[in-house]
């Protein structure tokens, strides 16, 4: 099946201190390689979360990503602050060999608006 990365929500609004879910689904797990969430675009984009075993405070995967056929790579961000505002991208990579992993497709992005409590 052809790979497609889908972020269904163009934007979400969340009150400061609350949590929000950023949805991301894939149509294929191939080629093998990690899925990562970034805020922003270009060389200055910020890595927010990687589904590769690293622990990140305040961020959890929504589904059981240890299922070998899992295609849901949504994340929950808890205790949101104004600094979390921005556009978040779910990005699928193909594994690298000696070179770094290669980005092959990105979702369309979800903008997070943080509202004052």
């Amino acid at each position: 099946k052809e790979l497609k990365v889908t972020q269904p929500e163009k934007s979400v609004s969340v009150a400061a201190g609350d949590s929000t879910v950023l949805n991301c689904t894939l149509t294929s797990l191939l080629p093998v390689g990690p899925i990562r969430w970034y805020r922003g675009v270009g060389p200055s984009r910020l890595l927010i979360y990687s589904f590769a075993g690293e622990y990140v405070p305040r961020i959890r995967n929504v589904s059981d990503t240890t299922k070998r056929n899992n295609m849901d790579f949504s994340i929950r961000i808890s205790n949101v602050t104004p600094a979390d505002a921005g556009i978040y991208y779910c990005v699928k990579f193909q594994k690298g060999s000696s070179e770094p992993d290669t980005e092959i497709q990105s979702g369309g992005g979800t903008e997070v608006y943080v509202l004052a409590k």
Partner: antibody, heavy 118, light 107 residues
């Protein structure tokens, strides 16, 4: 420190059943997929079965499908392998292993010996 | 099936390369496991093609390219004598497979 300790190995007769256990400690067991791997005498390693962190999804090699069942109890930090209709070919050391994010293995138990003999 | 040489030998200080072929680059991740004696617990020396656990010496490294993976031991030591198994996880079939193992002898 991550620790995996298998138990339940025994000498059994062909056709009998056995349940192996693996007690996990030193990590958040409920966050990791787990696998069983065995090694027959004088042979190499053979992956048998894997289970997702939540326990809902299981995976088997064809040769044990229908005879072996992998399961887990996250409240007890324990992994299990139920083995039915055992044959001499199932004689091996059985290891439990913790899976990495991409379903390879990072930590292994010391193993438990299963001998099937009449 | 994953194919690796049955045995390799080297003198202390030399560089050893053990290859593992038969996987599909598109769908396979590789790992390498050291077993010092039959029936003893395997030790992971490389997972995810090239990731070395923190307690494994830096002389062990891994790479993967095309349909093969390679374990390299740079400056091999006597204590590295063991059987080394490669394993693959195939994201197409959801199945793990081991190679038959390579016996490393340090002369």
């Amino acid at each position: 420190d991550v620790q995996l300790v298998e138990s339940g190995g025994a000498v059994v007769r062909p056709g009998e059943s056995l349940r192996l256990s693996c007690a996990a400690s030193g990590f958040t067991f409920s966050s990791y997929a787990m696998s069983w791997v065995r090694q027959a005498p004088g042979k190499g390693l053979e992956w048998l079965a894997g289970i997702s962190a939540g326990g809902s999804d299981t995976y088997y090699i064809d040769s044990v499908k229908g005879r072996f069942t992998i399961s887990r109890d996250n409240s007890e930090n324990s992994l299990y392998l139920q083995m039915n209709s055992l044959t001499a070919e199932d004689t091996a050391v059985y290891y439990c292993a913790r899976e990495t994010w991409n379903h390879l293995f990072d930590y292994w138990g010391l193993g438990t010996l299963v001998t099937v003999s009449s | 099936a994953l194919t690796q040489p049955a045995s390799v030998s080297a003198n202390p200080g030399e560089t050893v390369k053990i290859t593992c072929s038969g996987g599909d680059w598109y769908s396979t991740y590789y790992g390498w496991y050291q077993q010092k004696s039959p029936g003893s617990a395997p030790v992971t020396v490389i997972h995810s093609d090239d990731k070395r656990p923190s307690d494994i010496p830096s002389r062990f490294s891994g790479s993967a390219s095309g349909s093969a993976a390679t374990l390299t031991i740079t400056g091999v030591r006597v204590e590295d004598e063991a059987v080394y198994y490669c394993a693959g996880y195939d994201g197409r079939t959801y199945i793990n497979t081991f190679g038959a193992g390579t016996t490393l002898t340090v002369l």
